[in-house]
């Protein structure tokens, strides 16, 4: 399975949630409705 990181800092391996200690992706709109950067 593809590996990717979850909103609050999880990595998913074969659909198992494993906490990833950083706020990975926080600049990509991981938090629902939180304005990120400016208008692009």
């Amino acid at each position: 399975d593809a590996e990717f990181r979850h909103d609050s800092g999880y990595e998913v391996h074969h659909q198992k949630l494993v906490f990833f200690a950083e706020d990975v992706g926080s600049n990509k709109g991981a938090i629902i409705g939180l304005m990120v950067g400016g208008v692009v």
Epitope: A2, F4, H6, D7, S8, G9, Y10, L17, F19, A21, E22, D23, G25, K28, G29, A30, I31, I32, G33, L34, M35, V36, G37, V39, V40
Partner: antibody, heavy 112, light 111 residues
Framework: QVQLVQSGAEVKEPGASVKVSCTGS????????VHWLRQLPEKGLEWIGR????????IYTPKFQDKATLTVDTSTDTAYMELSSLRSEDTAVYYC?????WGQGTLVTVSS | DIVMTQSPLSNPVTPGEPASISCRSS???????????LYWYLQKPGQSPQLLIY???NLASGVPDRFSSSGSGTDFTLKISRVEAEDVGVYYC????????FGQGTKVEIK
């Protein structure tokens, strides 16, 4: 005005599929995650999942894993959510969200 | 799933008076990195929801400072110092420690 514009209301029969669109207006939807949520009539919010438009990677709430398919067409700055095998329990308002912007919601009614 | 439970489900308020809403999670939302993955949203009548507070105590952009949030790992409170007419709607707490789940909502209306 920066906004996300969703497609219009849909009425579908049980067992059918529906595809809801979410287009960025004055906003590049391909830059940030696109989240999809739903709100059942007179009920609370449920998170369906999200897609990273840069690479197409998705994550779903388990109950929607076989129900919803999230895609993005970066050439038109449009995100899509397709719902399959519709049942009456899927009647809800569906929202897309990207960065601080919410779509206006799309009512999907499943009725025979 | 982490279950989010709100109380009360309905909260009649008086303009100018304080108000509070409680939210409890079935699992601690405090991570060892020191962040608490608790959020508050408001859905005003006829509108899409909007983010009020993220990671327990951070005010989202444009949210008036009469809103505040506090809590422990499992028990949280949203406070409005002085309710205004525009604050009516349904308030939801949410978590994203494990995916995203929402509380059932608290309807705030003017008495």
């Amino acid at each position: 005005q920066v906004q996300l514009v969703q497609s219009g209301a849909e009425v579908k029969e049980p067992g059918a599929s529906v595809k809801v669109s979410c287009t960025g207006s004055g906003f590049n939807i391909h830059v940030y995650y696109v989240h999809w949520l739903r709100q059942l009539p007179e009920k609370g919010l449920e998170w369906i999942g999200r897609i990273d438009p840069e690479n197409g990677e998705t994550i779903y709430t388990p109950k929607f894993q076989d129900k919803a398919t999230l895609t993005v067409d970066t050439s038109t700055d449009t995100a899509y959510m397709e719902l399959s095998s519709l049942r009456s329990e899927d009647t809800a308002v569906y929202y897309c969200v990207s960065s601080g912007y919410w779509g206006q919601g799309t009512l999907v009614t499943v009725s025979s | 799933d982490i279950v989010m439970t709100q109380s009360p489900l309905s909260n009649p308020v008086t303009p100018g008076e304080p108000a509070s809403i409680s939210c409890r999670s079935s699992k601690s939302l405090l991570h060892r990195n020191g962040k608490t993955y608790l959020y508050w949203y408001l859905q005003k009548p006829g509108q899409s929801p909007q983010l009020l507070i993220y990671q327990m105590d951070n005010l989202a952009s444009g949210v008036p400072d009469r809103f505040s949030s506090s809590g422990s790992g499992t028990d949280f409170t949203l406070k409005i110092s002085r309710v205004e007419a525009e604050d009516v709607g349904v308030y939801y707490c949410a978590q994203n420690l494990e995916l995203w789940t929402f509380g059932q909502g608290t309807k705030v209306e003017i008495k």
